[in-house]
Structure formats: structure tokens, C-alpha cells
């Protein structure tokens, strides 16, 4: 199993919206995606969760744009403020 | 279940202060911007003041800036709107409104009502 | 500060056909390949309820009679087929920039 996220810094003005991009490998027929935001705290907030088998998530100002056959799954923040600023992980589980 | 409801509306005369209040339930509401949007009698939507997740970032009407102050309080998951000098064109239907994707307004409580006359 | 003016002020609209709202912005609601143009349905008595967000997505348990469509100035709400509950007036709201700015309304009637 493995995660990979390129972008490793990006930048937006508030109110508008960023994708952060995740690509996985998995041998797991089933699994979930998760996206996590982790604080100054080094805390991690659990932001929102794809299934494998589910349609597109979406939870308030996050949304994820879930592409199975291209293992991919991106994150989008909409709405942002400077409250957003911060680390994000995807991480796969079954 | 996201609920919003809103309270401290009444009757106030020219000139007077009141604040308004929303409790929020059902979601973290640490973790997201919202606003106060009015409604006069009859009229249409007017948004009134914007407050970030964590206060960092406020904004307001031209129509009420100086005299209305947004703020909120996380750890008692309440939205607050503190307003003063306040004048008859204020009164209106009083909404709290929650930031959703794309900076729409989401989930609304139910308002409540601002009277100013004397 | 954008203006945002809806057409028609008021439409009335057979049960089953195409009710269309029309919101011209003063200027591009676009930014980065978003259009940021909400549209509101409100009845008597209750508060605004979010149909669609950026343009075209539709909300969370809304029903898919409804529709957003446009970009840059010009968005549109399309209803079809109406059912008699979609009497209401429809507001459409910027957010693209501050102030946030909601277009005048449009009361829709069912025959």
C-alpha cells in the first residue's frame, strides 16, 4: 500500500477554493481514503472519509473528487480562510 | 444533524443596543466562517457581517459597519451580534447563517426578529 | 459592490413545465475557473434554503428538477418540471467577493 502527495506547499486567497491532490496504490479490494489536517499541535483533525465503493464525498467546505480507476483522490477546500493554513494528509485503510 | 437558532430579538427604541445570539449544534463549528444575514418586512436579503472560524478575519455591510460588532465564541459553540445605534431602517428578520462550499450559506436558523420604533 | 438583478421581478408557471430565473452580475463572479453564484429558494414564514452552490452543484438533498447553468455575468435557475411546493421566491447571492450581494428576487406561482 502507499500514498503519495506531490504538491508539498500551495497557496490561495481566502474565500476561494484549493485542491490538494493524493494518489494511492492499494492490493485492498475495499478501503476508505481519508483526509486529515494536522495543527500547530502537530493534532490531527479529521477532516472528511472516501470509500472505495461510495460516490464523490462531500462535507460542508470539503469535497473530494474520487477517481478510482486513476487512484486518485483530491481533496477540495472551499470557502478557505486563514484559519486553513495548515498541513494536510490523505491516508489510506481498509 | 447541523441546527442554528437564533436569539435576543425584541423591541428597541432609536439610538438603543441589543445583541443577538445563535447556538449552533451538530457540526464543528470551530472550524467554520459565518455570517449574519437580515431581512426587512417584506423586502429582500440583505448580508449584514462575516466572522472566520477563528475570529481572525471579520467583515461587514457598509450599511451597518461602526455600529454592529460580529464575534463568536467556540468553546460555547455561539455566534454573537452585538448592535447599537440602532436605527428604524435595522429592523428586520435576523438570520445566522453557516459559510458552506464555494462561500454559500448553507444551513440558516430560523431568525429572529429586531423591531426598532419608538 | 456587485449587483446582482434577477428577471422576472414575478413568473407564473404551469404545473409540470419550465420555470427559468435569470441573475446578470455587474460584473464576473469567476475566479479561477469557479463561478461564485448561489441561488436561495425562501417560502412564508421560513428562512432561505441553498439549491445550488457555485454556479451548478446542486445541494444535498435537493430535488434534480432543479438546475444552475452560466458563468462570468450571466447565471440562470431552471425548474422543470415545477411541482406546485416550488412556489416560493429565488434569490441568487455572490460570493465572490466582499460585501456578499443577493440578487432582488423572484416570486414564482404555480397555475
Known amino acids: 500500500q502507499k500514498v503519495t502527495q506531490a504538491q508539498s506547499s500551495v497557496s490561495m486567497p481566502v474565500r476561494k477554493a484549493v485542491t490538494l491532490n493524493c494518489l494511492y496504490e492499494t492490493s485492498w479490494w475495499s478501503y476508505y481514503i481519508f483526509w486529515y489536517k494536522q495543527l500547530p499541535s502537530k493534532e490531527m483533525i479529521f477532516l472528511i472519509r472516501q470509500g472505495s465503493d461510495e460516490q464523490n464525498a462531500k462535507s460542508g467546505r470539503y469535497s473530494v473528487n474520487f477517481k478510482k480507476a486513476a487512484k486518485s483522490v483530491a481533496l477540495t477546500i472551499s470557502a478557505l480562510q486563514l484559519e486553513d493554513s495548515a498541513k494536510y494528509f490523505c491516508a489510506l485503510g481498509e | 444533524e447541523v441546527q442554528l437558532v437564533e436569539s435576543g430579538g425584541g423591541l428597541v427604541k432609536p439610538g438603543g443596543s441589543l445583541k443577538l445570539s445563535c447556538a449552533a449544534s451538530?457540526?464543528?463549528?470551530?472550524?467554520?466562517?459565518m455570517h449574519w444575514v437580515r431581512q426587512a418586512p417584506e423586502k429582500g436579503l440583505e448580508w449584514v457581517a462575516y466572522i472566520s472560524s477563528g475570529s481572525r478575519t471579520i467583515y461587514y455591510a457598509d450599511t451597518v459597519k461602526g455600529r454592529f460588532t460580529i464575534s463568536r465564541d467556540n468553546a460555547k459553540n455561539t455566534l454573537f451580534l452585538q448592535m447599537t445605534s440602532l436605527r428604524s431602517e435595522d429592523t428586520a428578520m435576523y438570520y445566522c447563517?453557516?459559510?458552506?462550499?464555494?462561500?454559500?450559506?448553507?444551513?440558516w436558523g430560523q431568525g429572529t426578529t429586531l423591531t426598532v420604533s419608538s | 459592490d456587485i449587483v446582482l438583478t434577477q428577471s422576472p421581478a414575478s413568473l407564473a408557471v404551469s404545473l409540470g413545465q419550465r420555470a427559468t430565473i435569470s441573475c446578470k452580475a455587474s460584473q464576473s463572479v469567476d475566479y479561477d475557473g469557479d463561478s461564485y453564484m448561489n441561488w436561495y429558494q425562501q417560502k412564508p414564514g421560513q428562512p432561505p434554503k441553498l439549491l445550488i452552490y457555485?454556479?451548478?452543484n446542486l445541494e444535498s438533498g435537493i430535488p434534480a428538477r432543479f438546475s444552475g447553468s452560466g458563468s462570468g455575468t450571466d447565471f440562470t435557475l431552471n425548474i422543470h418540471p415545477v411541482e406546485e411546493e416550488d412556489a416560493a421566491t429565488y434569490y441568487c447571492?455572490?460570493?465572490?467577493?466582499?460585501?456578499?450581494?443577493f440578487g432582488g428576487g423572484t416570486k414564482l406561482e404555480i397555475k
Open positions: 447563517a453557516r459559510e458552506g462550499a464555494y462561500s454559500s450559506f448553507d444551513y
Open positions: 457555485a454556479a451548478s
Open positions: 451538530g457540526f464543528t463549528f470551530s472550524d467554520y466562517g
Open positions: 447571492q455572490q460570493s465572490n467577493e466582499d460585501p456578499w450581494t
